[in-house]
């Protein structure tokens, strides 16, 4: 059945922690992605940004999770108003920013 929101959020946080702790070489060869507004529709916005990174084994599971948590189909090259389109950051920074925000949501009990 569907993953309960609290479980989904916790799993995603654990995966992002795993990425940040195990990072040795530049994550995803230093690939750059669009920064996003960490607000409503965050899972889809994060996916729309990260889906444009290919060949990066470290974030494959994160991409899978975000794809499962986003209710609509997302393809590479697809953009929405949820992006801060004038700002690109490294995947490593994107992951750190996302992780900090998700931890905050988890502490506040905002699971959806």
């Amino acid at each position: 059945g569907p993953v309960p929101p609290s479980t989904a959020l916790r799993e995603l946080i654990e995966e992002l922690v795993n990425i940040t702790q195990n990072q040795k070489a530049p994550l995803c060869n230093g690939s750059m992605v669009w920064s996003i507004n960490l607000t409503a529709g965050m899972y889809c916005a994060a996916l729309e940004s990260l889906i444009n990174v290919s060949g990066c084994s470290a974030i494959e599971k994160t991409q899978r999770m975000l794809s499962g948590f986003c209710p609509h189909k997302v393809s590479a090259g697809q953009f929405s108003s949820l992006h801060v389109r004038d700002t690109k950051i490294e995947v490593a920074q994107f992951v750190k920013d996302l992780l900090l925000h998700l931890k905050k949501l988890f502490r506040e009990g905002q699971f959806n």
Partner: antibody, heavy 118, light 111 residues
């Protein structure tokens, strides 16, 4: 335009080793993963392994002890090496690129035919 | 390893009719709400060509007469209506778990 092209020895003696090069164009190996797949004559497809853009290598455990996959990003080349060859390793060997998530193989080379025979 | 069993091994379908190919996985290929099952077409003397990804999504440039469905362990590729140029062998493939595996293939003949 995305292209992949395999080049191999054609004929290899039993017990010998095989080296195949996949030369790609139209994309960067730092950003894309490359799979190796083989197909014996008249039979189905078998995944051998892959090398990710970030350098991680995944092998098919059934062949891992005989396989080595590597790449040279600057030359846009991926290499497959296989040792202790047997006659049942006779096949067409393909390299194939993973597309974006969900990482299905969206572009394939034409394949190179390898015959293991004395 | 996840074993993919395709059926039938071969089928002959009249031009303009529907062709249905089944792929059954030995365990679920679903992960976080997606089915990591893909379909390929291989014509004689050519490499495989991606048709469908994530069970039901049509690859760019593939005609709409191809469609995919299914989840967990049971998947179907449908071609409706079949055209002469669809004569080929069709393979399912999963990448939910390593090693990636392919089905044994289904050879489609057009009557």
């Amino acid at each position: 335009e995305v292209q992949l092209k395999e080049s191999g020895p054609g004929l290899v003696a039993p017990g010998g080793s095989l080296s195949i090069t996949c030369t790609v164009s139209g994309f960067s190996l730092t950003d894309s993963s490359i799979n190796w797949v083989r197909q014996p004559p008249g039979k189905g497809l078998e995944w051998l392994g892959m090398i990710w853009g970030d350098g991680r290598i995944d092998y098919n455990d059934a062949l891992k002890s005989r396989l080595s996959i590597s790449k040279d990003n600057s030359k846009s080349q991926v290499f497959l090496e296989m040792n202790s060859l047997r006659t049942d390793d006779t096949a067409t060997y393909y390299c194939a690129r993973d597309g974006y998530f969900p990482y299905a193989m969206d572009f394939w080379g034409q394949g190179t035919s390898v015959t293991v025979s004395s | 390893d996840i074993v993919l069993t395709q059926s039938p091994a071969s089928l002959a379908v009249s031009l303009g009719q529907r062709a249905t190919i089944s792929c059954r996985a030995s365990e679920s290929v679903d992960s976080y709400g997606n089915s990591y099952m893909h379909w390929y077409q291989q014509k004689a003397g050519q490499p495989p060509k991606l048709l469908i990804y994530l069970a039901s999504n049509l690859e760019s440039g593939v005609p709409a007469r191809f469609s995919g469905s299914g989840s967990r362990t049971d998947f179907t590729l449908t071609i409706d209506p079949v055209q002469a140029e669809d004569a080929a062998t069709y393979y399912c493939q999963q990448n939910n778990e390593d090693p990636r595996t392919f089905g044994g293939g289904t050879k489609l003949e057009i009557k």
